[in-house]
């Protein structure tokens, strides 16, 4: 018996087609992805093949103005239109709190939404009961397939799930649910979830009875043969893991942003054992037509976005200096504003020992593309912020050793004075440079804000200590020459859309007046 699994993950509100790098589509003849194009390909495959499941491994939420405006209603609407069969909860599904998940998505989705390792407690337990499930048994042709969901146990540090959801260890939580499916005589089981490729592989290895793992979170691109675009494969598709009980378990993921549609064909024997698996992600490039009816619906929903981008988010009573003459040479108040917003967006009161789990922010000055003049009645709009942060990036959470951070700050000024983009703006960091010293030895003082303290204060950076830092995904990926971050980071979790982080902060503060306050000094 053959099953076709079509899968997406980490779509991050790319409902419209995008450029090849998943930013805003500029030249339509070169654009990719989007739900209208995805629908065309899904329909084609459904027409051709008998037993097809369309699955999403989480993080539909967060990433473009679509999410900012529609807050998840767009996800439910278009996933319903595409007739998804199931979705796993990702960490970003909690970005607007549990209510922001329940109302727009859980209550509106016409497909099951899954996670076996999220347990509700207290008053939330009855409110959310039945709105998401640990697993779902789906009829597919003449057979049944069990889908069991999982979500990153790090979600409380990455999003806003509140205090009434407990995120258990994935493997511990999955095993009893898979066992339950086995007692229900379900012999074909897919683990669908959002914990990253390393955890996906562990699930394949450790959870008895899981036949296939469909993952997300790490934006992993797997491919067999010559890859069709810029993404470099992390391994073959499917990636085969030998389980502890000797089975060959295919593990798949389909990069991110709706650029690819994962296509996996599995052949099962009559006892539900995987006999063979093959496939590849399908690049959704512009040679695949956008479905006219879905496209028309997208255009209808778009109207509200255009209106939103000119509405006032808040006011500034000071000039927001985002000029390259400032932000690439010295501390600039636009950099301070953005870093403060980045930290504010990551406030998670973890326990009594820590006032927060992260206190530090770094931001390449070259990523700040425009100032905002306060003399326009102080008004700040999404449109204004899009000029400051035009690249559609994310502000991510990483873990780095102190020694890596020191290298990053040396890189920040290694060729100072040439108006290059690597000059770092900061938050929760005090740095002093001596430019008379040779490149690679210019950081004379580097103090960082404590997190394990009731009254935050600045302490010298410790080389061997591991620190959490919020930074643009551009830097996490080694951009602007920050190869040491890419090479030495110990953990990387993708965060929220950059403009959304700053716009939310400004809306929350209502009136802003960021200053230049001595975060960056020259001796």
């Amino acid at each position: 018996w053959e099953l076709t699994i079509l899968h997406t993950n980490d779509v991050h509100s790319r409902l419209e087609q995008t450029s090849e790098d998943s930013s805003k589509c500029v030249n339509a003849s070169r654009c990719m992805g989007g739900v209208a194009r995805l629908f065309t390909k899904v329909q084609q495959i459904r027409r051709a093949e008998p037993n097809v499941l369309l699955l999403d491994a989480g993080d539909q939420y967060q990433g473009t103005i679509w999410f900012t405006v529609y807050k998840g209603a767009e996800v439910a609407h278009f996933m319903n239109a595409l007739r998804y069969d199931a979705m796993a909860l990702g960490n970003h599904e909690f970005d607007n709190g549990v209510e922001g998940l329940i109302e727009p998505l859980l209550k509106e989705a016409k497909f099951p939404i899954l996670s076996a390792n999220i347990k509700a407690k207290g008053p939330l337990a009855s409110q959310i009961s039945g709105l998401y499930l640990p697993y779902k048994v789906l009829p597919v042709g003449d057979e049944v397939v069990g889908i069991v969901g999982y979500t990153s146990k790090e979600t409380p540090f990455l999003s806003n799930p509140g205090t009434n959801l407990v995120f258990e260890d994935e493997i511990t939580a999955l095993q009893p649910e898979v066992d339950k499916l086995k007692t229900l005589n379900v012999n074909k089981i897919i683990a669908l979830g959002h914990s990253g490729f390393e955890t996906d592989k562990l699930i394949a290895q450790k959870v008895r009875g899981v036949d296939v793992v469909v993952g997300g979170h790490s934006n992993t691109f797997l491919y067999t043969g010559n890859p069709p675009s810029k993404e470099v494969p992390a391994g073959k598709y499917p990636f085969i893991v030998t389980s502890d009980d000797g089975r060959k378990v295919p593990v798949v993921q389909a990069y991110a942003f709706g650029k690819y549609l994962g296509y996996l064909k599995i052949e099962f024997d009559e006892r539900g054992n995987v006999i063979s698996s093959h496939g590849n992600p399908i690049l959704l490039n512009s040679s695949i037509p956008e479905d006219p009816s879905i496209k028309a619906d997208i255009n209808k929903w778009r109207i509200k976005l255009d209106n939103y981008s000119t509405q006032e988010l808040g006011k500034t009573i000071v000039y927001l200096d985002g000029s390259s003459q400032s932000c690439r040479f010295r501390e600039c108040n636009m950099g301070n504003l953005i870093c403060d917003a980045m930290i504010n967006n990551n406030l998670r009161h973890a326990d009594e020992m820590f006032w927060n789990h992260v206190s530090m922010c770094i931001l390449n000055g070259g990523g700040i593309r425009s100032p905002i003049d306060e003399r326009n009645n102080g008004t700040i709009t999404w449109e204004n912020l899009a000029a400051v942060l035009p690249f559609g990036g994310t502000f991510d959470l990483v873990q780095l050793k102190g020694s890596t951070l020191k290298k990053a700050f040396e890189h920040s000024v290694h060729r100072y004075g040439q108006s290059t983009g690597e000059f770092l703006q900061v938050g929760g960091i005090h740095v002093v440079y001596d430019l008379s010293r040779k490149p690679g030895d210019r950081v004379v003082k580097l103090d960082v804000l404590c997190t394990k303290c009731r009254v935050p204060s600045y302490d010298p950076l410790k080389m061997d200590e591991i620190y959490k830092v919020i930074l643009p995904n551009f830097l996490a990926n080694g951009g602007d020459g920050f190869q040491m971050i890419k090479d030495e980071l110990l953990r990387h979790d993708s965060g929220d859309q950059d403009i959304n982080v700053v716009s939310t902060y400004i809306s929350k503060m209502k009136v802003i007046y960021p200053a230049v306050e001595g975060r960056i000094k020259f001796s």
Epitope: A48, E49, Y263
Partner: antibody, heavy 121, light 107 residues
Framework: EVQLVQSGAEVKKPGESLKISCKGS????????LSWVRQMPGKGLEWMGE????????YYNEKFKGQVTISADKSISTAYLQWSSLKASDTAMYYC??????????????WGAGTTVTVSS | DIVMTQSPDSLAVSLGERATINCKAS??????VAWYQQKPGQPPKLLIY???YRYSGVPDRFSGSGSGTDFTLTISSLQAEDVAVYYC?????????FGGGTKLEIK
């Protein structure tokens, strides 16, 4: 090398049955769709229907539904077009054509050389 | 059914000159249009798929454009071997329908 090899020309009488074939080679037969296209003498092209050999799913142009049957035998990588009762108006060239539904070439990328069917009393 | 109206029915163009063939769909077919060349006694050959993508091995003098309902096949510099009948086809909805064909000759 991808090839679609069609069976030879046929001369039939009205009311007779006929089954013509199209054998695919040089590719995974079950991973593509196969269509049948009719071209009447001196006329244009008409899509009759298609089969996806992997699933056996068939789709017909309403105009040809009930007039012809499309089938496939994946064990020998061959698709068929058959009539139970031919008419003089079935006289035409019949092409099979391949469709890559997993790829992005929206069109028929390989065609057979065609089978001429002549129906005459 | 979606009707594909091709124009002109026939076209005579001098060698080295540009030839343009148009195709109009009776409803929006996005970019799901292919163009074929058929020479006497031969099966059709795919030239352009998805409205504007040249199929592998097709000379770059052939190009396609359009989306929605209006599509064009252009031969930038006509060669003697381009004499043939050209068909457009929509691949958006079944039944997949072809245009009536354009017979291209040398002037």
């Amino acid at each position: 090398e991808v090839q679609l090899v069609q069976s030879g020309a046929e001369v039939k009488k009205p009311g007779e049955s006929l089954k013509i074939s199209c054998k695919g080679s040089g590719y995974t037969f079950t991973s593509y769709g196969l269509s049948w296209v009719r071209q009447m003498p001196g006329k244009g092209l008409e899509w009759m229907g298609e089969i996806y050999p992997g699933s056996g799913n068939t789709y017909y142009n309403e105009k040809f539904k009930g007039q012809v049957t499309i089938s496939a035998d994946k064990s020998i990588s061959t698709a068929y077009l058959q009539w139970s009762s031919l008419k003089a108006s079935d006289t035409a060239m019949y092409y099979c054509a391949r469709y890559d539904y997993l790829g992005s070439s929206y069109g028929f990328d390989y065609w057979g050389a065609g089978t001429t069917v002549t129906v005459s009393s | 059914d979606i009707v594909m109206t091709q124009s002109p029915d026939s076209l005579a163009v001098s060698l080295g000159e540009r030839a343009t063939i148009n195709c109009k769909a009776s409803q929006d077919v996005s970019t799901a249009v292919a163009w074929y060349q058929q020479k006497p006694g031969q099966p059709p050959k795919l030239l352009i798929y998805s409205a504007s993508y040249r199929y592998s091995g097709v000379p770059d003098r052939f190009s396609g454009s359009g989306s929605g309902t209006d599509f064009t096949l252009t031969i930038s510099s006509l060669q003697a071997e381009d004499v043939a009948v050209y068909y457009c086809q929509q691949h958006y909805n079944t039944p997949y329908t072809f245009g009536g064909g354009t017979k291209l000759e040398i002037k």
